[in-house]
Interface confidence: low
Amino acid sequence: EEELQVIQPDKSISVAAGESATLHCTVTSLIPVGPIQWFRGAGPGRELIYNQKEGHFPRVTTVSDLTKRNNMDFSIRISNITPADAGTYYCVKFRKGSPDHVEFKSGAGTELSVRAKPSAPVVSGPAARATPQHTVSFTCESHGFSPRDITLKWFKNGNELSDFQTNVDPAGDSVSYSIHSTAKVVLTREDVHSQVICEVAHVTLQGDPLRGTANLSETIRVPPTLEVTQQPVRAENQVNVTCQVRKFYPQRLQLTWLENGNVSRTETASTLTENKDGTYNWMSWLLVNVSAHRDDVKLTCQVEHDGQPAVSKSHDLKVSAHPKEQGSNTAPGPALASAAPL
Protein backbone atom coordinates (compact mmCIF):
# COMPACT_ATOMS: atom_id res chain seq x y z
CA GLU A 1 0.00 0.00 0.00
CA GLU A 2 1.18 3.52 -0.81
CA GLU A 3 2.78 5.34 2.13
CA LEU A 4 0.65 7.96 3.90
CA GLN A 5 1.01 11.55 2.66
CA VAL A 6 0.08 14.65 4.65
CA ILE A 7 -1.45 17.19 2.30
CA GLN A 8 -1.67 20.87 3.16
CA PRO A 9 -3.12 22.28 -0.06
CA ASP A 10 -2.66 25.96 0.81
CA LYS A 11 0.90 27.21 0.63
CA SER A 12 -0.24 30.46 2.20
CA ILE A 13 -3.40 32.16 3.39
CA SER A 14 -4.07 35.71 4.44
CA VAL A 15 -6.69 36.59 7.04
CA ALA A 16 -7.93 39.91 8.39
CA ALA A 17 -7.49 40.49 12.11
CA GLY A 18 -10.63 39.43 13.99
CA GLU A 19 -11.66 36.83 11.42
CA SER A 20 -11.22 33.05 11.56
CA ALA A 21 -8.49 31.15 9.69
CA THR A 22 -9.10 27.70 8.27
CA LEU A 23 -5.98 25.57 7.88
CA HIS A 24 -6.59 22.59 5.63
CA CYS A 25 -4.98 19.20 6.11
CA THR A 26 -5.86 15.77 4.79
CA VAL A 27 -4.06 12.44 4.94
CA THR A 28 -4.08 9.81 2.18
CA SER A 29 -4.21 6.73 4.40
CA LEU A 30 -5.47 5.53 7.75
CA ILE A 31 -2.22 3.69 8.35
CA PRO A 32 -0.12 3.99 10.46
CA VAL A 33 -2.36 4.48 13.47
CA GLY A 34 -1.58 7.58 15.49
CA PRO A 35 -2.73 11.12 16.17
CA ILE A 36 -2.41 14.35 14.20
CA GLN A 37 -0.95 17.46 15.80
CA TRP A 38 -0.72 21.02 14.49
CA PHE A 39 2.36 23.14 15.14
CA ARG A 40 3.37 26.68 14.38
CA GLY A 41 6.94 26.67 13.15
CA ALA A 42 9.25 23.75 12.55
CA GLY A 43 12.30 22.41 14.29
CA PRO A 44 13.46 23.55 17.71
CA GLY A 45 10.94 25.40 19.78
CA ARG A 46 7.93 24.78 17.54
CA GLU A 47 4.67 25.74 19.18
CA LEU A 48 1.85 23.24 19.67
CA ILE A 49 -1.41 24.64 18.26
CA TYR A 50 -3.68 21.62 18.44
CA ASN A 51 -3.38 18.08 19.71
CA GLN A 52 -6.04 15.63 18.61
CA LYS A 53 -5.85 13.55 21.79
CA GLU A 54 -5.29 15.91 24.71
CA GLY A 55 -4.96 19.50 25.79
CA HIS A 56 -7.15 22.59 25.90
CA PHE A 57 -7.20 24.74 22.75
CA PRO A 58 -10.10 27.19 23.21
CA ARG A 59 -9.65 29.07 19.91
CA VAL A 60 -9.18 25.95 17.78
CA THR A 61 -11.99 23.82 16.39
CA THR A 62 -11.79 20.93 13.94
CA VAL A 63 -13.61 21.23 10.64
CA SER A 64 -14.53 17.51 10.52
CA ASP A 65 -15.64 15.06 13.18
CA LEU A 66 -12.37 13.43 14.20
CA THR A 67 -14.20 10.68 16.08
CA LYS A 68 -15.54 9.23 12.82
CA ARG A 69 -13.85 5.97 12.02
CA ASN A 70 -12.60 6.71 8.52
CA ASN A 71 -11.94 10.44 8.92
CA MET A 72 -8.99 11.69 6.88
CA ASP A 73 -9.64 15.44 7.18
CA PHE A 74 -7.72 17.10 9.99
CA SER A 75 -8.33 20.71 9.03
CA ILE A 76 -8.66 23.20 11.88
CA ARG A 77 -10.23 26.63 12.30
CA ILE A 78 -8.60 29.25 14.55
CA SER A 79 -11.00 31.96 15.69
CA ASN A 80 -10.42 35.66 16.36
CA ILE A 81 -7.10 35.91 14.55
CA THR A 82 -4.66 38.57 15.69
CA PRO A 83 -1.33 39.63 14.16
CA ALA A 84 0.38 37.51 16.84
CA ASP A 85 -0.98 34.39 15.11
CA ALA A 86 1.04 34.90 11.94
CA GLY A 87 3.49 32.16 11.06
CA THR A 88 3.80 28.83 9.26
CA TYR A 89 1.50 26.07 10.48
CA TYR A 90 2.36 22.40 10.05
CA CYS A 91 0.00 19.44 10.17
CA VAL A 92 2.05 16.53 11.56
CA LYS A 93 1.13 12.85 11.62
CA PHE A 94 2.45 10.75 14.51
CA ARG A 95 2.79 6.97 14.65
CA LYS A 96 1.48 5.35 17.79
CA GLY A 97 4.32 4.33 20.05
CA SER A 98 5.13 3.43 23.61
CA PRO A 99 5.58 5.41 25.73
CA ASP A 100 5.63 8.31 23.23
CA HIS A 101 4.20 8.79 19.78
CA VAL A 102 6.82 9.13 17.06
CA GLU A 103 6.65 11.84 14.42
CA PHE A 104 5.93 10.12 11.13
CA LYS A 105 5.31 12.75 8.48
CA SER A 106 4.70 16.49 8.24
CA GLY A 107 2.72 18.52 5.75
CA ALA A 108 4.53 21.15 3.70
CA GLY A 109 3.17 23.93 5.90
CA THR A 110 0.69 26.78 5.40
CA GLU A 111 1.95 30.29 5.94
CA LEU A 112 -0.65 32.40 7.69
CA SER A 113 -0.28 36.13 7.29
CA VAL A 114 -2.57 38.43 9.23
CA ARG A 115 -3.88 41.64 7.81
CA ALA A 116 -4.36 44.37 10.41
CA LYS A 117 -5.37 47.90 9.46
CA PRO A 118 -3.07 50.82 10.16
CA SER A 119 -4.32 53.46 12.57
CA ALA A 120 -5.36 56.83 11.17
CA PRO A 121 -2.16 58.73 10.30
CA VAL A 122 -1.31 61.54 12.70
CA VAL A 123 0.54 64.47 11.14
CA SER A 124 2.41 66.94 13.31
CA GLY A 125 4.35 70.01 12.35
CA PRO A 126 7.16 72.00 13.94
CA ALA A 127 6.78 73.40 17.44
CA ALA A 128 7.53 76.97 16.34
CA ARG A 129 6.23 78.97 13.39
CA ALA A 130 8.49 79.61 10.42
CA THR A 131 8.52 82.25 7.71
CA PRO A 132 8.25 81.86 3.93
CA GLN A 133 11.30 80.47 2.11
CA HIS A 134 12.16 78.38 5.15
CA THR A 135 12.03 74.57 5.09
CA VAL A 136 9.99 72.93 7.82
CA SER A 137 9.57 69.27 8.76
CA PHE A 138 6.31 67.41 9.21
CA THR A 139 6.04 63.95 10.71
CA CYS A 140 3.42 61.31 10.05
CA GLU A 141 2.85 58.22 12.18
CA SER A 142 0.58 55.22 11.82
CA HIS A 143 0.60 52.07 13.93
CA GLY A 144 -0.66 48.55 14.35
CA PHE A 145 -0.66 47.27 10.77
CA SER A 146 0.28 43.91 9.34
CA PRO A 147 1.71 42.72 7.01
CA ARG A 148 4.70 45.02 6.93
CA ASP A 149 4.33 46.19 3.32
CA ILE A 150 2.84 49.69 3.29
CA THR A 151 2.98 52.76 1.07
CA LEU A 152 3.14 56.29 2.38
CA LYS A 153 2.85 59.44 0.27
CA TRP A 154 2.98 63.14 1.10
CA PHE A 155 1.01 65.88 -0.62
CA LYS A 156 0.86 69.63 -0.36
CA ASN A 157 -2.41 70.97 -1.77
CA GLY A 158 -2.79 67.88 -3.94
CA ASN A 159 0.77 67.99 -5.28
CA GLU A 160 2.90 64.99 -4.33
CA LEU A 161 6.04 65.77 -2.34
CA SER A 162 9.31 63.97 -2.93
CA ASP A 163 11.54 65.15 -0.09
CA PHE A 164 10.72 62.73 2.71
CA GLN A 165 12.17 59.80 4.63
CA THR A 166 10.14 56.85 5.87
CA ASN A 167 10.89 54.05 8.32
CA VAL A 168 8.85 50.98 9.16
CA ASP A 169 9.56 49.50 12.59
CA PRO A 170 10.57 47.08 13.80
CA ALA A 171 12.77 45.80 11.02
CA GLY A 172 12.42 42.18 11.98
CA ASP A 173 9.50 40.03 12.97
CA SER A 174 6.69 41.70 14.86
CA VAL A 175 3.03 41.10 15.55
CA SER A 176 2.37 44.49 13.99
CA TYR A 177 4.29 47.40 12.58
CA SER A 178 4.51 51.16 12.77
CA ILE A 179 5.45 53.65 10.09
CA HIS A 180 7.12 56.98 10.71
CA SER A 181 7.81 59.49 7.98
CA THR A 182 9.34 62.97 7.95
CA ALA A 183 8.68 65.32 5.05
CA LYS A 184 10.39 68.61 4.31
CA VAL A 185 8.18 71.44 3.02
CA VAL A 186 9.35 74.85 1.73
CA LEU A 187 6.94 77.56 2.87
CA THR A 188 5.69 80.30 0.56
CA ARG A 189 3.78 83.51 1.36
CA GLU A 190 0.65 81.92 -0.12
CA ASP A 191 0.62 78.95 2.26
CA VAL A 192 -1.80 80.19 4.92
CA HIS A 193 -4.60 78.17 3.33
CA SER A 194 -2.33 75.25 2.37
CA GLN A 195 -2.59 71.72 3.73
CA VAL A 196 -0.01 68.99 4.09
CA ILE A 197 -1.47 65.51 3.71
CA CYS A 198 0.05 62.16 4.64
CA GLU A 199 -1.58 59.26 2.81
CA VAL A 200 -1.14 55.64 3.86
CA ALA A 201 -2.08 52.73 1.58
CA HIS A 202 -2.18 49.16 2.88
CA VAL A 203 -3.58 45.85 1.68
CA THR A 204 -6.23 45.97 4.43
CA LEU A 205 -7.69 49.24 3.16
CA GLN A 206 -8.99 47.91 -0.17
CA GLY A 207 -7.61 50.79 -2.19
CA ASP A 208 -9.12 53.45 0.07
CA PRO A 209 -6.08 55.03 1.74
CA LEU A 210 -6.10 56.69 5.13
CA ARG A 211 -5.14 60.36 5.34
CA GLY A 212 -3.86 62.64 8.02
CA THR A 213 -3.64 66.38 7.50
CA ALA A 214 -1.93 69.41 8.93
CA ASN A 215 -2.88 72.99 8.15
CA LEU A 216 0.06 75.22 7.32
CA SER A 217 -1.80 78.04 9.05
CA GLU A 218 -0.57 76.40 12.27
CA THR A 219 3.02 76.52 11.03
CA ILE A 220 3.54 79.63 8.94
CA ARG A 221 4.27 83.19 9.99
CA VAL A 222 4.03 85.76 7.20
CA PRO A 223 5.73 88.97 8.37
CA PRO A 224 4.01 92.23 7.42
CA THR A 225 5.14 94.83 4.93
CA LEU A 226 4.84 98.42 6.15
CA GLU A 227 4.15 101.59 4.25
CA VAL A 228 3.87 105.03 5.87
CA THR A 229 2.26 107.80 3.81
CA GLN A 230 0.95 111.27 4.46
CA GLN A 231 -2.13 112.98 3.05
CA PRO A 232 -3.11 116.57 3.63
CA VAL A 233 -6.42 117.18 5.34
CA ARG A 234 -8.80 120.08 5.02
CA ALA A 235 -7.55 121.85 8.10
CA GLU A 236 -4.57 123.81 6.93
CA ASN A 237 -2.19 122.83 9.74
CA GLN A 238 -3.08 119.13 9.98
CA VAL A 239 -1.54 116.22 8.17
CA ASN A 240 -2.94 112.68 8.15
CA VAL A 241 -0.17 110.09 8.42
CA THR A 242 -1.15 106.45 7.81
CA CYS A 243 0.73 103.22 8.43
CA GLN A 244 -0.44 100.41 6.15
CA VAL A 245 0.40 96.98 7.58
CA ARG A 246 -0.07 94.46 4.81
CA LYS A 247 -0.05 90.74 4.18
CA PHE A 248 0.66 89.35 7.64
CA TYR A 249 -0.30 86.14 9.41
CA PRO A 250 -1.26 85.25 12.13
CA GLN A 251 -3.39 88.15 13.40
CA ARG A 252 -1.43 88.93 16.56
CA LEU A 253 0.05 92.37 16.00
CA GLN A 254 0.83 95.46 18.05
CA LEU A 255 1.62 98.86 16.55
CA THR A 256 3.43 101.76 18.18
CA TRP A 257 3.75 105.30 16.83
CA LEU A 258 6.95 107.12 17.72
CA GLU A 259 7.47 110.87 17.40
CA ASN A 260 11.17 111.67 17.11
CA GLY A 261 11.86 108.39 18.90
CA ASN A 262 9.39 108.94 21.72
CA VAL A 263 6.37 106.67 22.12
CA SER A 264 3.23 108.47 21.17
CA ARG A 265 0.65 105.72 21.06
CA THR A 266 0.42 101.91 21.14
CA GLU A 267 -2.49 99.93 19.80
CA THR A 268 -3.38 96.30 19.16
CA ALA A 269 -4.71 95.27 15.77
CA SER A 270 -8.42 94.70 15.83
CA THR A 271 -10.66 95.27 12.82
CA LEU A 272 -8.55 93.47 10.22
CA THR A 273 -9.31 92.89 6.58
CA GLU A 274 -8.57 89.41 5.25
CA ASN A 275 -6.93 88.83 1.89
CA LYS A 276 -7.84 85.98 -0.44
CA ASP A 277 -4.61 84.17 0.49
CA GLY A 278 -5.54 84.17 4.18
CA THR A 279 -3.17 86.97 5.21
CA TYR A 280 -4.42 90.16 6.86
CA ASN A 281 -4.13 93.91 6.31
CA TRP A 282 -4.51 96.68 8.85
CA MET A 283 -4.15 100.44 8.86
CA SER A 284 -3.46 102.93 11.61
CA TRP A 285 -3.41 106.68 11.18
CA LEU A 286 -2.48 109.87 12.98
CA LEU A 287 -3.56 113.47 12.60
CA VAL A 288 -0.46 115.59 13.04
CA ASN A 289 -0.88 119.19 14.13
CA VAL A 290 2.00 120.72 12.20
CA SER A 291 1.66 124.12 13.79
CA ALA A 292 2.76 122.66 17.12
CA HIS A 293 6.21 121.88 15.76
CA ARG A 294 9.15 124.19 15.28
CA ASP A 295 11.37 121.55 13.58
CA ASP A 296 10.83 118.64 11.22
CA VAL A 297 9.22 115.59 12.77
CA LYS A 298 10.35 111.98 12.31
CA LEU A 299 7.30 109.72 12.61
CA THR A 300 7.95 106.01 13.01
CA CYS A 301 5.41 103.19 12.70
CA GLN A 302 6.79 100.26 14.70
CA VAL A 303 5.11 96.86 14.46
CA GLU A 304 5.61 93.83 16.66
CA HIS A 305 4.11 90.79 14.92
CA ASP A 306 3.42 87.48 16.65
CA GLY A 307 6.01 88.09 19.35
CA GLN A 308 8.83 88.65 16.87
CA PRO A 309 11.36 91.51 17.00
CA ALA A 310 9.76 94.79 15.93
CA VAL A 311 9.98 96.09 12.37
CA SER A 312 9.51 99.75 11.62
CA LYS A 313 9.08 102.28 8.87
CA SER A 314 9.73 106.02 9.30
CA HIS A 315 8.41 109.12 7.59
CA ASP A 316 9.95 112.58 7.80
CA LEU A 317 7.38 115.30 8.12
CA LYS A 318 8.82 118.58 6.87
CA VAL A 319 7.43 121.23 9.18
CA SER A 320 9.04 124.04 7.12
CA ALA A 321 6.93 123.05 4.15
CA HIS A 322 3.72 123.99 6.02
CA PRO A 323 2.57 127.57 6.76
CA LYS A 324 2.59 128.31 10.47
CA GLU A 325 -0.25 130.06 12.24
CA GLN A 326 0.48 133.23 14.16
CA GLY A 327 1.79 132.31 17.60
CA SER A 328 2.03 128.68 16.71
CA ASN A 329 4.97 128.17 18.99
CA THR A 330 2.65 128.67 21.93
CA ALA A 331 -0.30 126.93 20.41
CA PRO A 332 -2.20 124.88 22.96
CA GLY A 333 -3.20 121.24 22.50
CA PRO A 334 -1.35 118.13 21.48
CA ALA A 335 1.02 118.04 18.57
CA LEU A 336 -0.32 114.62 17.52
CA ALA A 337 -3.99 113.87 17.38
CA SER A 338 -4.55 110.14 17.53
CA ALA A 339 -7.27 108.51 15.56
CA ALA A 340 -8.90 105.17 15.76
CA PRO A 341 -7.67 102.72 13.15
CA LEU A 342 -9.73 102.43 10.01
Partner: antibody, heavy 122, light 107 residues
Framework: EVQLVQSGAEVVKPGASVKLSCKAS????????MHWVKQAPGQGLEWIGA????????TYNQKFKGKATLTVDKSASTAYMELSSLRSEDTAVYYC???????????????WGQGTLVTVSS | DIQMTQSPSSLSASVGDRVTITCRAS??????LNWLQQKPGKAPKRLIY???SLDSGVPSRFSGSGSGTEFTLTISSLQPEDFATYYC?????????FGGGTKVEIK
Protein backbone atom coordinates in the same frame (compact mmCIF):
# COMPACT_ATOMS: atom_id res chain seq x y z
CA GLU B 1 18.25 20.56 9.43
CA VAL B 2 18.89 24.28 9.26
CA GLN B 3 22.56 25.25 9.12
CA LEU B 4 24.34 28.58 8.87
CA VAL B 5 27.92 28.17 7.66
CA GLN B 6 30.23 31.18 7.87
CA SER B 7 33.44 31.95 5.99
CA GLY B 8 36.86 31.42 7.58
CA ALA B 9 38.97 33.67 9.82
CA GLU B 10 40.46 36.86 8.34
CA VAL B 11 43.54 38.89 9.23
CA VAL B 12 43.36 42.36 7.71
CA LYS B 13 45.33 45.59 7.90
CA PRO B 14 43.95 48.80 9.44
CA GLY B 15 42.00 50.86 6.91
CA ALA B 16 41.21 47.84 4.72
CA SER B 17 37.81 46.18 4.16
CA VAL B 18 36.65 42.60 4.58
CA LYS B 19 33.57 40.74 3.33
CA LEU B 20 32.19 37.89 5.44
CA SER B 21 29.68 35.33 4.19
CA CYS B 22 26.98 33.22 5.80
CA LYS B 23 25.42 30.40 3.78
CA ALA B 24 22.03 29.06 4.83
CA SER B 25 20.82 25.57 4.09
CA UNK B 26 17.92 23.40 5.11
CA UNK B 27 15.05 25.91 4.87
CA UNK B 28 13.55 28.67 2.79
CA UNK B 29 16.32 31.24 2.92
CA UNK B 30 14.17 34.17 1.85
CA UNK B 31 11.48 34.12 4.52
CA UNK B 32 13.89 34.95 7.32
CA UNK B 33 15.79 38.02 8.41
CA MET B 34 19.52 37.34 8.57
CA HIS B 35 21.14 39.16 11.48
CA TRP B 36 24.77 39.86 12.26
CA VAL B 37 26.17 40.06 15.78
CA LYS B 38 29.60 41.25 16.98
CA GLN B 39 31.54 39.86 19.93
CA ALA B 40 34.83 41.58 20.72
CA PRO B 41 37.41 39.50 22.64
CA GLY B 42 36.21 38.93 26.21
CA GLN B 43 33.17 41.13 25.61
CA GLY B 44 29.42 40.69 25.26
CA LEU B 45 27.21 40.51 22.18
CA GLU B 46 26.20 43.47 20.01
CA TRP B 47 23.56 43.45 17.29
CA ILE B 48 24.89 45.01 14.07
CA GLY B 49 21.92 44.81 11.72
CA ALA B 50 19.78 42.54 9.60
CA UNK B 51 18.74 41.97 6.00
CA UNK B 52 15.54 40.48 4.57
CA UNK B 53 16.51 38.50 1.46
CA UNK B 54 13.10 38.81 -0.23
CA UNK B 55 13.63 42.48 -1.07
CA UNK B 56 17.07 43.21 0.44
CA UNK B 57 15.43 45.45 3.03
CA UNK B 58 18.05 46.29 5.67
CA THR B 59 18.06 47.66 9.16
CA TYR B 60 21.14 48.74 11.08
CA ASN B 61 22.13 49.54 14.60
CA GLN B 62 23.00 53.25 14.32
CA LYS B 63 26.40 52.48 15.86
CA PHE B 64 27.37 50.33 12.85
CA LYS B 65 25.99 52.51 10.06
CA GLY B 66 28.84 53.29 7.72
CA LYS B 67 30.90 50.47 9.19
CA ALA B 68 28.86 47.45 8.08
CA THR B 69 27.07 46.89 4.75
CA LEU B 70 24.70 43.93 4.45
CA THR B 71 23.87 42.24 1.15
CA VAL B 72 22.43 38.91 -0.03
CA ASP B 73 22.70 36.58 -2.98
CA LYS B 74 19.33 34.82 -3.01
CA SER B 75 20.38 32.31 -5.66
CA ALA B 76 23.26 31.16 -3.45
CA SER B 77 21.25 31.38 -0.20
CA THR B 78 24.11 33.47 1.17
CA ALA B 79 24.19 36.65 3.21
CA TYR B 80 27.22 38.93 3.27
CA MET B 81 28.54 41.58 5.59
CA GLU B 82 31.26 43.95 4.45
CA LEU B 83 33.19 45.81 7.13
CA SER B 84 35.06 48.90 5.95
CA SER B 85 37.80 51.24 7.24
CA LEU B 86 38.85 48.61 9.73
CA ARG B 87 40.48 49.58 13.03
CA SER B 88 41.82 47.56 15.94
CA GLU B 89 38.48 47.91 17.78
CA ASP B 90 36.80 46.00 14.94
CA THR B 91 38.75 42.88 15.96
CA ALA B 92 35.99 40.46 16.97
CA VAL B 93 34.10 37.30 16.19
CA TYR B 94 31.15 38.06 13.92
CA TYR B 95 28.14 35.74 13.98
CA CYS B 96 25.19 35.43 11.65
CA UNK B 97 21.86 34.36 13.12
CA UNK B 98 18.35 34.36 11.85
CA UNK B 99 14.76 35.24 12.69
CA UNK B 100 11.42 34.61 11.07
CA UNK B 101 9.65 37.37 9.14
CA UNK B 102 6.33 36.87 10.87
CA UNK B 103 5.42 36.70 14.52
CA UNK B 104 6.87 33.35 15.36
CA UNK B 105 8.68 33.68 18.66
CA UNK B 106 10.13 30.21 18.32
CA UNK B 107 12.19 31.23 15.31
CA UNK B 108 14.06 34.20 16.77
CA UNK B 109 17.83 33.71 17.04
CA UNK B 110 17.64 29.95 17.36
CA UNK B 111 20.08 29.18 14.55
CA TRP B 112 23.60 30.65 14.67
CA GLY B 113 26.62 30.39 12.42
CA GLN B 114 29.89 29.18 13.94
CA GLY B 115 31.33 32.72 13.82
CA THR B 116 34.13 34.34 11.85
CA LEU B 117 37.12 35.84 13.66
CA VAL B 118 38.32 39.09 12.10
CA THR B 119 41.71 40.31 13.35
CA VAL B 120 42.77 43.83 12.46
CA SER B 121 46.51 44.12 12.73
CA SER B 122 49.31 45.93 10.95
CA ASP C 1 17.12 52.09 22.10
CA ILE C 2 16.04 49.55 24.71
CA GLN C 3 18.76 48.94 27.30
CA MET C 4 19.01 45.49 28.86
CA THR C 5 20.62 45.45 32.30
CA GLN C 6 21.68 41.99 33.44
CA SER C 7 22.74 41.03 36.93
CA PRO C 8 24.91 39.76 38.39
CA SER C 9 27.75 40.11 35.89
CA SER C 10 29.34 36.98 37.38
CA LEU C 11 28.62 34.44 40.09
CA SER C 12 30.31 31.43 41.67
CA ALA C 13 28.18 28.42 42.46
CA SER C 14 28.48 24.72 43.18
CA VAL C 15 26.95 21.76 41.38
CA GLY C 16 23.40 21.30 42.67
CA ASP C 17 22.92 24.98 43.54
CA ARG C 18 19.89 26.95 42.45
CA VAL C 19 20.98 29.91 40.32
CA THR C 20 18.93 32.98 39.38
CA ILE C 21 19.93 35.57 36.79
CA THR C 22 17.84 38.70 36.21
CA CYS C 23 17.47 41.00 33.26
CA ARG C 24 15.78 44.41 33.34
CA ALA C 25 14.55 46.19 30.18
CA SER C 26 14.52 49.98 30.04
CA UNK C 27 11.00 49.83 28.56
CA UNK C 28 8.17 47.32 28.19
CA UNK C 29 9.09 44.48 25.82
CA UNK C 30 6.10 42.25 26.58
CA UNK C 31 7.40 38.68 26.57
CA UNK C 32 9.80 39.05 23.64
CA LEU C 33 12.94 37.93 25.40
CA ASN C 34 15.41 35.10 24.74
CA TRP C 35 17.99 33.59 27.05
CA LEU C 36 21.20 32.38 25.41
CA GLN C 37 24.04 30.24 26.73
CA GLN C 38 27.58 30.63 25.41
CA LYS C 39 30.59 28.49 26.14
CA PRO C 40 34.15 29.67 25.38
CA GLY C 41 35.00 29.55 21.68
CA LYS C 42 31.44 28.57 20.70
CA ALA C 43 28.47 30.35 19.16
CA PRO C 44 25.63 31.28 21.50
CA LYS C 45 22.89 28.67 21.94
CA ARG C 46 19.32 29.66 22.63
CA LEU C 47 17.81 28.07 25.74
CA ILE C 48 14.54 29.94 26.15
CA TYR C 49 12.39 32.02 23.82
CA UNK C 50 9.36 34.23 24.49
CA UNK C 51 10.45 34.63 28.14
CA UNK C 52 9.49 31.15 29.31
CA SER C 53 9.30 28.65 26.41
CA LEU C 54 12.03 26.04 26.59
CA ASP C 55 13.83 25.08 23.39
CA SER C 56 13.66 21.40 22.48
CA GLY C 57 16.58 19.46 23.91
CA VAL C 58 17.12 21.97 26.72
CA PRO C 59 16.95 20.33 30.17
CA SER C 60 13.92 21.16 32.29
CA ARG C 61 16.15 22.51 35.07
CA PHE C 62 16.24 25.72 33.02
CA SER C 63 13.21 27.98 33.32
CA GLY C 64 12.35 31.56 32.48
CA SER C 65 9.77 33.96 33.87
CA GLY C 66 8.74 37.60 33.89
CA SER C 67 7.08 40.07 31.55
CA GLY C 68 7.21 43.73 30.67
CA THR C 69 10.53 44.91 32.07
CA GLU C 70 11.64 42.30 34.65
CA PHE C 71 12.84 38.84 33.58
CA THR C 72 14.48 35.90 35.32
CA LEU C 73 16.42 32.82 34.22
CA THR C 74 16.54 30.08 36.84
CA ILE C 75 18.69 26.96 36.88
CA SER C 76 17.07 24.80 39.53
CA SER C 77 20.04 22.47 40.09
CA LEU C 78 23.31 23.51 38.51
CA GLN C 79 25.12 20.80 36.54
CA PRO C 80 28.80 20.73 35.47
CA GLU C 81 27.86 21.42 31.83
CA ASP C 82 25.97 24.60 32.85
CA PHE C 83 29.11 26.57 33.65
CA ALA C 84 29.03 29.19 30.88
CA THR C 85 28.05 32.77 30.16
CA TYR C 86 24.33 33.58 29.87
CA TYR C 87 22.84 36.49 27.92
CA CYS C 88 19.35 37.89 27.70
CA UNK C 89 18.25 39.34 24.34
CA UNK C 90 15.21 41.49 23.57
CA UNK C 91 13.65 41.20 20.14
CA UNK C 92 10.68 43.52 20.71
CA UNK C 93 12.18 46.53 19.03
CA UNK C 94 15.05 47.32 16.70
CA UNK C 95 17.91 47.74 17.45
CA UNK C 96 17.78 44.37 19.21
CA UNK C 97 19.86 44.46 22.36
CA PHE C 98 21.63 41.98 24.62
CA GLY C 99 22.24 42.08 28.32
CA GLY C 100 25.86 42.43 29.40
CA GLY C 101 26.12 38.72 30.25
CA THR C 102 26.42 36.68 33.45
CA LYS C 103 29.42 34.37 33.82
CA VAL C 104 28.58 31.34 35.95
CA GLU C 105 31.77 29.90 37.43
CA ILE C 106 32.55 26.90 39.62
CA LYS C 107 32.96 27.78 43.27
Amino acid sequence: EVQLVQSGAEVVKPGASVKLSCKASGSTFTSYWMHWVKQAPGQGLEWIGAIYPVNSDTTYNQKFKGKATLTVDKSASTAYMELSSLRSEDTAVYYCTRSFYYSLDAAWFVYWGQGTLVTVSS
Amino acid sequence: DIQMTQSPSSLSASVGDRVTITCRASQDIGSRLNWLQQKPGKAPKRLIYATSSLDSGVPSRFSGSGSGTEFTLTISSLQPEDFATYYCLQYASSPFTFGGGTKVEIK
